[in-house]
């Protein structure tokens, strides 16, 4: 479900002769006027809509937080795309902030995955090869992590 699907400014288009099942909707990059007759453009760099809609207002563009870089700006049809700065990542269960990546693995573990903007370094036990999920108590070695490239829209 997108942010737009949950938007509160839904309206019922006024009853009138309909030319198609979707009359009363406006294209991406627009919202509908209060009387339901016109489509009004979102304001470039300020707000957006991503789907055909009957929103009374476009959705406000996200501003990237400090600790994030802007991968692509907000357009009238797409929200800003923000990414954690190098050396930090955003977890699925705590998407509101970027957290620092660990610099190395605990004793008895080896690094098998680098720090990326969406994941911490990945460590596995030397012998068993099983992943380690807890916090690192003591660090055996310091490994500089390298950032990844894929982007994800800010939430």
């Amino acid at each position: 479900i997108t942010q737009q699907d949950l938007a509160p400014q839904q309206r019922v288009a006024p009853q009138q002769k309909r030319s198609s099942p979707s009359e009363g909707l406006c294209p991406p990059g627009h919202h509908i006027s209060e009387d339901g007759r016109d489509c009004i453009s979102c304001k470039y760099g300020q707000d957006y809509s991503t789907h055909w809609n009957d929103l009374l207002f476009c959705l406000r563009c996200t501003r990237c937080d400090s600790g994030e870089v802007e991968l692509s700006p907000c357009t009238t049809t797409r929200n800003t795309v923000c990414q954690c700065e190098e050396g930090t990542f955003r977890e699925e269960d705590s998407p509101e902030m970027c957290r620092k990546c660990r610099t190395g693995c605990p004793r008895g573990m080896v690094k098998v995955g680098d720090c990326t903007p969406w994941s911490d370094i990945e460590c596995v036990h030397k012998e068993s090869g099983t992943k380690h999920s807890g916090e690192a108590p003591a660090v055996e070695e310091t490994v500089t992590s390298s950032p990844g490239t894929p982007a994800s829209p800010c939430s």
């Epitope: 030319s19 198609s20 099942p21 979707s22 009359e23 909707l25 294209p27 991406p28 990059g29 627009h30 006027s33 016109d38 489509c39 009004i40 453009s41 304001k43 470039y44 055909w52 357009t75 009238t76 049809t77």
Partner: antibody, heavy 119, light 107 residues
Framework: QVQLVQSGAEVKKPGASVKVSCKAS????????LHWVRQAPGQGLEWMGW????????KYNEKFKDRVTITADKSTSTVYMELSSLRSEDTAVYYC????????????WGQGTLVTVSS | DIQMTQSPSFLSASVGDRVTITCRAS??????VAWYQQKPGKAPKLLIY???TRHTGVPDRFSGSGSGTDFTLTISSLQPEDIATYYC?????????FGGGTKLEIK
């Protein structure tokens, strides 16, 4: 490359109807909105309405709403504009044009179809 | 409906001149304005959208500016092939409307 090819010139009598076609090629038909814009001789441009093949959305300029009908045949990637109850002031070149699902400017245009209304 | 008033209606200039065409909207249209070039017997061609963004393949001698109600199309150095009629269009609110056009000719 993107092409919008329109049907040929028409001469009609007042009160009659005309149906102009616009065949699209060179892009995915269901991803762009197609519009009709007209231009009377020596005059400016006037937006008439749109059709979006992706969800069959149609929107008309209120000025033409009672007389214009826009339809499409997705199997041939063709959009049609029918204008009824023709009068002499409907004499114009009728263009189809497309725009992305976003800002309402037109990046490609058909070659135009001259419709002459004369008794 | 929003009225788009273009000026001048006719403009005569020499090759190499800097040419400016203005367009005034009857109400605020933010930056939702496009400019088109139309040569006789041909369909319009998109030059500028969002008031100042040049369309793909448009020479950089064409530039646009403005926001709110006042907009400008500038040709920095007029070329013979620029002889045409130019139209502004607001794409802020339906029905989308066009200016009356500016016919540009060589002195």
């Amino acid at each position: 490359q993107v092409q919008l090819v329109q049907s040929g010139a028409e001469v009609k009598k007042p009160g009659a109807s005309v149906k102009v076609s616009c065949k699209a090629s060179g892009y995915t038909f269901t991803e762009y909105i197609l519009h009709w814009v007209r231009q009377a001789p020596g005059q400016g441009l006037e937006w008439m309405g749109w059709f979006y093949p992706g969800n069959n959305n149609i929107k008309y300029n209120e000025k033409f709403k009672d007389r214009v009908t826009i339809t499409a045949d997705k199997s041939t990637s063709t959009v049609y504009m029918e204008l009824s109850s023709l009068r002499s002031e409907d004499t114009a070149v009728y263009y189809c044009a497309r725009h992305e699902q976003g800002p309402g400017y037109f990046d490609y245009w058909g070659q135009g179809t001259l419709v002459t209304v004369s008794s | 409906d929003i009225q788009m008033t273009q000026s001048p209606s006719f403009l005569s200039a020499s090759v190499g001149d800097r040419v400016t065409i203005t367009c005034r909207a009857s109400q605020d249209v933010n930056t939702a304005v496009a400019w088109y070039q139309q040569k006789p017997g041909k369909a319009p061609k998109l030059l500028i959208y969002w008031a100042s963004t040049r369309h793909t393949g448009v020479p950089d001698r064409f530039s646009g500016s403005g926001s709110g109600t006042d907009f400008t199309l500038t040709i920095s150095s007029l070329q013979p092939e620029d002889i045409a009629t130019y139209y502004c269009q607001q794409h802020y609110i339906t029905p989308w409307t066009f200016g009356g056009g500016t016919k540009l000719e060589i002195k």
